[in-house]
């Protein structure tokens, strides 16, 4: 009795869904009551399918309402684990353990990344020096560096700070500021450059005609 996996690595985006599959041999018709399926993720039990039913009381709380065994796939010889609303904590090595006459197990790695897609921006001006402060902020994983460039492709020197997100423990909150003397309609770009998997996300900042003076300066 041998189980197989078509993929031993899945890469999924934070907040997305993933279905990981282990295939097991089924001759003729599946006898559900002879089938045993366990899914574990390191020290956490996710699925315990015995005697034709899933026992949710033994499921680890971190997977509650998010993980399920796709029962219809069992008849096709597939133990498919579906996880919805994927979290960074879901990353790791999963193990499917299947008993059907014989018994076997296989490991599958899940990697989770979070692109720095929603970049919020702010432009303010110092009334004394007339210097503009440009700010870009986004959350993602893993860590990113921020590259500032001008419309003529000059690389500019900004200041970046990285903190942990309030939303999720492992998510990074990356904020970068650029102080520069700029004129109206001038365009600047902040690019969040992330490695593993490599991805760039850029926001465009256009210097407005007139900026309101901060209330504290009035």
């Amino acid at each position: 009795f041998t189980i197989t996996v078509s993929k031993d690595l899945y890469v999924v985006e934070y907040g997305g869904n993933v279905t990981m599959e282990c295939k097991f041999p089924v001759e003729k018709q599946l006898n559900l009551f002879a089938l045993i399926v366990y899914w574990e993720m390191e020290d956490k039990k996710i699925i315990q399918f015995v005697n034709g039913k899933e026992d949710l009381k033994v499921q680890h709380s971190s997977y509650s309402q998010r993980a399920q065994l796709l029962k219809d796939q069992l008849f096709l010889g597939k133990a498919a684990l579906q996880i919805t609303d994927v979290r960074l904590q879901d990353a790791g090595v999963y193990c499917c353990l299947i008993g059907y006459g014989g018994a076997d197990y296989k490991r599958i790695t899940l990697k989770v990344h979070a692109p720095y897609r929603n970049i919020s921006q702010r432009i303010s001006v110092d009334p004394v020096t007339s210097e503009h402060e440009l700010m870009c902020q986004a959350e993602g994983y893993p860590e990113a560096e921020v590259i500032w460039t001008s419309s003529d492709h000059r690389v500019l020197s900004g200041k970046t700070t990285i903190t942990n997100s309030n939303r999720e423990e492992k998510l990074f909150n990356v904020t970068s500021t650029l102080n520069i003397n700029a004129t109206a309609n001038e365009i600047f770009y902040c690019t969040f450059q992330r490695s593993g998997p490599e991805e760039n996300n850029t926001a465009e900042l256009v210097i407005p005609e007139r900026l309101p003076v901060p209330a504290s300066e009035r």
């Epitope: 045993i36 366990y38 574990e40 390191e42 020290d43 956490k44 039990k45 315990q48 015995v50 026992d55 009381k57 033994v58 499921q59 680890h60 709380s61 904590q89 990353a91 790791g92 090595v93 353990l97 299947i98 008993g99 018994a103 076997d104 197990y105």
Partner: antibody, heavy 121, light 112 residues
Framework: QVQLVQSGAEVRKPGSSVKVSCKAS????????ISWVRQAPGQGLEWMGR????????NYAQKFQGRVTITADKSTSTAYMELSSLRSEDTAVYYC??????????????WGQGTLVTVSS | QSALTQPASVSGSPGQSITISCTGT?????????VSWYQQHPGKAPKLLIY???NRPSGVPDRFSGSKSGTSASLAITGLQAEDEADYYC???????????FGGGTKLTVLG
């Protein structure tokens, strides 16, 4: 109330093997992972491996790989741990322990009383 | 050499509070894994005190609490009592070893 009852103390010569049993009563045996943990005299706890009895699938700590075999008999709700090529450093109390709901390896809520294995020539 | 590092001993007087630390790495305590704590009296089997970092099984007094931050976990005992004198062990899953690991143990002495 779940109870794990282990076999009695054993004395073995270096190079030989020992097989310790752990009989469960008062709860579902086969679907919970059963681990074996040992404790040498005056030393700390050391995880050796685990089995899911309903599947008969066992995983072992790297240190014991090739020397330990964990098995289970669903019909008698008994788990077994066999350690071969015994040496004096294997003298220890061997415990079986059951993993609680939601977990696969740690978080042992029920323990056997322990079995002392003495390896001496 | 244990995978998780605990102080060899701690002590306190009755009524006092103590904390026992358990330091690991990113592959065990510092990962997404959960830490459990056990109490062991001489000649007895260990008893589960804390599971899943900070949860107490029924029957364990609320004087015992667990927490985790980064690659370290802690067991706190408030209002020390004579019967708390025992050895305490932390445990976690180690993803680099694909198995369970224990700390070396901490002997708690209740003075006086």
């Amino acid at each position: 109330q779940v109870q794990l009852v282990q076999s009695g103390a054993e004395v073995r010569k270096p190079g030989s093997s020992v097989k310790v049993s752990c009989k469960a009563s008062g709860g579902t045996f086969s679907s919970y992972a059963i681990s074996w943990v040992r404790q040498a005299p005056g030393q700390g706890l050391e995880w050796m491996g685990r089995i899911i009895p309903i599947l008969g699938i066992a995983n072992y700590a790297q240190k014991f790989q090739g020397r330990v075999t964990i098995t289970a008999d669903k019909s008698t709700s008994t788990a077994y741990m066999e350690l071969s090529s015994l040496r004096s450093e294997d003298t220890a109390v061997y415990y079986c322990a059951r993993t609680m709901d939601g977990y696969s390896y740690g978080n042992f809520d029920y323990w056997g009383q322990g079995t002392l294995v003495t390896v001496s020539s | 050499q244990s995978a998780l590092t605990q102080p060899a001993s701690v002590s306190g007087s009755p009524g006092q509070s103590i904390t026992i630390s358990c330091t690991g790495t990113s592959s065990d305590v510092g990962g997404y894994n959960y830490v459990s704590w056990y109490q062991q009296h001489p000649g007895k089997a260990p008893k589960l005190l804390i599971y899943g970092n900070s949860n107490r099984p029924s029957g364990v007094p609320d004087r015992f609490s667990g927490s985790k931050s980064g690659t370290s976990a802690s067991l706190a005992i408030t209002g020390l009592q004579a019967e708390d004198e025992a050895d305490y062990y932390c445990q976690s899953y180690d993803s680099s070893l694909s198995g369970s690991v224990f700390g070396g143990g901490t002997k708690l002495t209740v003075l006086g």
